[in-house]
Interface confidence: medium
């Protein structure tokens, strides 16, 4: 029974996106009155793990010595004090990379593009996948999903940009995944440097569908325009 206690804070070190085989530590921070910490994993009978608090009792450590597919998923934690159990923490989504071979990322017609023109980033996988993710380095909200509908699987996804501005310049990587578990991603593609030349600065591009993002103006996700190239794919903004 959730009580009036404030919810704890849940985070992962070194981060929530972990390569297969690497170690990760999940931390749950509550209050100094905490007597016990509990970690729950979605789709797993609770509790997933229990730990006694570390001095000075306001947090607990849950260790995963070697990241595997089993540990990927959504977690919440609680703490118990003399007056009862806290509210649940906000969820932590632990994502594993390295579940599939790396895709190839390329730019069409070229990674060198003139401002105001168009470019398409193409993410290709060796085997058919139904989710592709494009990441731009140093973006606060870097993930753009192209996800197939009805289980249709593709060998590639296209991320068109038009018109290109200087904001689009930077380093990109892509991942592929299966829709049944967006907590399991491929190895990252090799990086692709998109270079935008020309001093003409057009208006910021806007997506074909309305996008809500908490990022600042320089940290918004890549915003492609035009029709989705594969009818079976649809955009998901995160």
């Amino acid at each position: 029974q959730a009580g009036p206690l404030p919810k704890p804070t849940l985070w992962a070190e070194p981060g929530s996106v972990i390569s297969w085989g690497n170690s990760v530590t999940i931390w749950c921070q509550g209050t100094l009155e905490a007597r016990e910490y509990r970690l729950d994993k979605e789709e797993s009978p609770a509790p997933w793990d229990r730990q006694n608090p570390l001095e000075p009792k306001n947090k607990a450590r849950f260790s995963i010595p070697s990241m595997t597919e089993d540990y990927a998923g959504r977690y919440r934690c609680y703490y118990r004090s003399p007056v009862g159990w806290s509210q649940p923490s906000d969820p932590l989504e632990l994502v594993m990379t390295g579940a599939y071979s790396k895709p190839t990322l390329s730019a069409l017609p070229s990674p060198l593009v003139t401002s105001g023109k168009s470019v398409t980033l193409l993410c290709q996988s060796r085997s058919p996948m139904d989710t592709f993710l494009l990441i731009k380095e140093r973006a606060a909200h870097p993930l753009l999903h192209l996800r197939s509908e009805h289980g249709a699987q593709q060998h590639q996804a296209e991320f068109p940009m038009s018109p290109v501005t200087s904001v689009h310049g930077g380093t990109y990587r892509c991942f592929s995944s299966h829709g049944f578990s967006h907590y399991l991603l491929s190895h990252p593609s090799d990086p692709l440097e998109l270079i935008v030349s020309g001093s003409l600065e057009g208006p910021r591009p806007s997506p074909t569908r309305s996008v809500s993002t908490a990022a600042g103006p320089e940290d918004q996700p890549l915003m492609p325009t035009g029709s989705v190239p594969h009818s079976g794919l649809r955009r998901h903004w995160e």
Epitope: D49, D70, A72, G73, S101
Partner: antibody, heavy 123, light 107 residues
């Protein structure tokens, strides 16, 4: 209905390499863990190792220096190689499938097994 | 490595009896535990996964419980066809160790 079938020589000479293949029929090899397990005569089950369809592997530490598990998704099979075998490696060898990615509905047990193949190490 | 210890190593019970087999992990494994049944000369069969989830097609007289380090497989009413060796197995991380097995016989 997915089925697994082990194949390989039933007799291996000491110090040689044991090679077995598990063919997966009636289903995809993708998105599952694929394991090898063995059972010496009159003894319990021993987990040898697993491979995920990505090629990620984990092995039993007691066998790690001698074991290689590989997968060929195009042929829908995975394989076991155990080097420098001795009489202690005589056993029934099973291949098995484990669900086990997040959200799979069976993220645990090995729900499909091959019939097993008996391997004898002897000269 | 985490060790899995089953008890008892063998037991004899009468048809209709309630039978309990326990499995203890040397460290906590949450609910990453499966139970298997192996009848003489046959392939192991999955009974329970995630400590307490009954595999499809397994009779409801089988049940599993536990989390962390202590787990139990229960047969609510023993039947003649339940004669077998039962194994627990952990799979939270490699190695996916099996218990040594519990041989169940009918009195």
């Amino acid at each position: 209905q997915i089925q697994l079938q082990e194949s390989g020589p039933g007799l291996v000479n000491p110090s040689k390499t044991l090679s077995l293949t598990c063919t997966v029929s009636g289903g995809s090899i993708r998105s599952y863990f694929w394991s090898w397990i063995r059972q010496p005569p009159g003894k319990g089950l021993e987990w040898i190792g697993y491979i995920y369809d990505s090629g990620n592997t984990n092995y039993n530490p007691s066998l790690k220096s001698r074991v290689t598990i590989s997968v060929d998704t195009s042929k829908n099979h995975f394989s076991l190689k155990l080097s420098s075998v001795t009489a202690a490696d005589t056993a029934v060898y099973y291949c098995a499938r484990r669900g086990g990615y997040y959200g799979s509905g069976n993220y645990g047990g090995m729900d499909v097994w091959g019939q097993g193949t008996t391997v004898t190490v002897s000269s | 490595d985490i060790q899995m210890t089953q008890s008892p190593s063998s037991l004899s019970a009468s048809v209709g009896d309630r039978v309990t087999i326990t499995c203890r992990a040397s460290q906590g494994i949450s609910n990453y535990l499966a139970w298997y049944q192996q009848k003489p000369g046959k392939v192991p069969k999955l009974l329970i996964y995630a400590a307490s989830t009954l595999q499809s097609g397994v009779p409801s007289r089988f049940s599993g419980s536990g989390s962390g380090t202590d787990f139990t497989l229960t047969i609510s009413s023993l039947q003649p066809e339940d004669v077998a060796t039962y194994y627990c197995q952990k799979y939270n991380s490699a190695p996916w160790t099996f218990g040594q097995g519990t041989k169940l016989e009918i009195k």
